[in-house]
């Protein structure tokens, strides 16, 4: 990890995260996520925290993006859309939503997969958080690679 | 090219890929690309081979990204939905996922367009090749823009 | 902003933009944009013209991004599936298509969202445009997060 | 599940050419990486070459690359290695491995026997001087 905080130097190490979606019990509709598998964590100016938050250290502008991929049916699910939302807690500010897909639920049934992306460029506070929510958690799909999260600093 | 490899010095060129699909006769499930219409190729550190992986020569962290458009029924179409893989293969180690997203056939006739887009930041070594996949091939839609992959170095 | 700038130094500044849709009572094709809620524009090096096209003044690569979410319906909509397309206009060059992804229209009632991203590398020059284009305007969803556009120069 | 059946072993002058053979069966062997092992007397068993499922990308054995050449066909099931230049160190018993595309074990490298799920019951090649 050493190697990609030295490619620019020590003033502008690479700050980058990959985190990959784990299944959880709880009945919060904040997604969790593992370090495991092919997930990236460049160094310790990007941390997870709680299984359920990038948190940074560095000011500046971060390309940050989910997928998220679930199976739903029309009838089973309620009539609102699933939708995933990419949202930011900076430190004494509330909560924001930064970015929302919104996809109808599908006739297949049992359910029917859909993938939702996210993606933009932010600028994010000394110890700002990023995380990502959805309408209904138990409808994700935790198969390798269908449901991540990252960032990258410019 | 060259303006892009010069404008980091010499010791940390700019390296990025965009390579737009290829219908192809061929019976693989793994996606044509090539170097045509409005695509990036930044210089020989990363290329591509074979008409299908983007292979890079420097070891570090890379954003990777692919978008299929396709059309399918779902009548025509087997049950499982349309999956799109983004895949890794580094030397001495097996092919492996890096990223899927899928999306349930359309009820459309003769078929629904959907697109897929998948992306995420990921640590390559020298010698590493990515590449898409997908379930069927022959769905995919190559009109100008609808499908493409591409690479950049952070 | 100035802090964006002066990260990599005075010869190399950090250039990004993310804009938010805003609903229009125009009746062209391509989304108006604007600077509000939680925005980027890093510095003068790249703006948002007449509300609907983000300009760069310097050459080189730029990852650009567009998300669209929008809510149609089979019935009510044409047989056409819902297209948004990521254009460029290059001083002296005619209009081209950079990135296009397609839905079909979905069958629930009054009408069911969906989202779709775009995102790619591509060389701009100086003075060059990008814009979003899309079938139907008045089907896009302007809700918070919603929609976007973005770019970053590597 | 899937069953391997090796072939086309057989006693070889040094210098000779050799082209082993691999038959699939059971499900599709599109969706398996495979590879050829080898086992000299009285040795462990080592890593020869290897070919992806999906790209058909080779991996080989630094020793071996020059002179051998991995390769399958899909319409037919079957995976080959060629060899050629053959030396008296090179007579061992051949396997055939073959390992899930979608397997995830402990080992993510082509050249470790762990990594494999299926094995064939192998082919002597003989080389003389």
């Known amino acids: 990890e050493n190697s990609f905080e030295m490619q620019k130097g020590d003033q502008n190490p690479q700050i980058a995260a990959h985190v990959i979606s784990e299944a959880s019990s709880k009945t919060t509709s904040v997604l969790q996520w593992a370090e495991k598998g092919y997930y990236t964590m460049s160094n310790n100016l990007v941390t997870l925290e709680n299984g359920k938050q990038l948190t940074v250290k560095r000011q500046g502008l971060y390309y940050i993006y989910a997928q998220v991929t679930f199976c739903s049916n029309r009838e089973a699910s309620s009539q609102a859309p699933f939708i995933a939302s990419l949202c930011l807690k900076s430190p004494g500010r509330f909560e924001r939503i930064l970015l929302r897909a919104a996809n109808t639920h599908s006739s297949a049934k049992p359910c029917g997969q859909q993938s939702i992306h996210l993606g933009g460029v932010f600028e994010l506070q000394p110890g700002a958080s990023v995380f990502v929510n959805v309408t209904d958690p138990s409808q994700v799909s935790h198969g390798t690679g269908f449901t991540s999260f990252g960032l990258l600093k410019l | 090219e060259n303006s892009f490899e010069m404008q980091k010095g010499d010791q940390n060129p700019q390296i990025a890929a965009h390579v737009i699909s290829e219908a192809s006769s061929k019976t693989t499930s793994v996606l044509q690309w090539a170097e045509k219409g409005y695509y990036t190729m930044s210089n020989n550190l990363v290329t591509l081979e074979n008409g299908k992986q983007l292979t890079v020569k420097r070891q570090g962290l890379y954003y990777i990204y692919a978008q299929v458009t396709f059309c399918s029924n779902r009548e025509a179409s087997s049950q499982a939905p349309f999956i799109a893989s983004l895949c890794l293969k580094s030397p001495g180690r097996f092919e492996r996922i890096l990223l899927r997203a899928a999306n349930t056939h359309s009820s459309a006739k003769p078929c629904g367009q959907q697109s897929i887009h998948l992306g995420g930041v990921f640590e390559l070594q020298p010698g590493a090749s990515v590449f898409v996949n997908v379930t069927d091939p022959s769905q995919v839609s190559h009109g100008t823009g609808f499908t493409s992959f591409g690479l950049l170095k952070l | 902003e100035n802090s964006f700038e002066m990260q990599k130094g005075d010869q190399n500044p950090q250039i990004a933009a993310h804009v938010i849709s805003e609903a229009s009572s125009k009746t062209t094709s391509v989304l108006q944009w604007a600077e509000k809620g939680y925005y980027t524009m890093s510095n003068n090096l790249v703006t948002l013209e007449n509300g609907k096209q983000l300009t760069v003044k310097r050459q080189g690569l730029y990852y650009i991004y567009a998300q669209v979410t929008f809510c149609s319906n089979r019935e009510a909509s044409s047989q056409a599936p819902f297209i948004a397309s990521l254009c460029l206009k290059s001083p002296g060059r005619f209009e081209r298509i950079l990135l296009r992804a397609a839905n079909t229209h979905s069958s629930a009632k009054p009408c069911g969202q969906q989202s779709i991203h775009l995102g790619g590398v591509f060389e701009l020059q100086p003075g060059a445009s990008v814009f979003v284009n899309v079938t139907d305007p008045s089907q896009v969803s302007h809700g918070t997060g919603f929609t976007s556009f973005g770019l970053l120069k590597l | 599940e899937v069953q391997l059946v090796e072939s086309g072993g057989g006693l070889v002058q040094a210098g000779g050419s050799l082209r082993l053979s691999c038959a699939a069966s059971g499900r599709t062997p599109l969706n398996y990486h495979m590879a050829w092992f080898r086992q000299a007397p009285g040795k462990e068993r080592e890593f020869v070459a290897a070919i992806s499922s999906l790209l058909g990308s080779t991996d080989y054995s630094d020793s071996l690359k020059d002179r051998f050449t991995i390769s399958r066909d899909n319409a037919k099931a079957t995976l080959y290695l060629r060899m050629n230049n053959l030396k008296p160190e090179d007579t061992a018993v051949y396997y055939c491995?073959?390992?899930?595309?979608?397997?995830?074990?402990?080992?993510?490298?082509?050249?470790?026997?762990?990594?494999?799920?299926?094995w064939g019951q192998g082919t002597l090649v003989t080389v003389s001087s």
């Open positions: 491995a073959a390992r899930e595309t979608t397997h995830y074990s402990t080992s993510d490298r082509v050249n470790e026997m762990r990594s494999y799920d299926y």
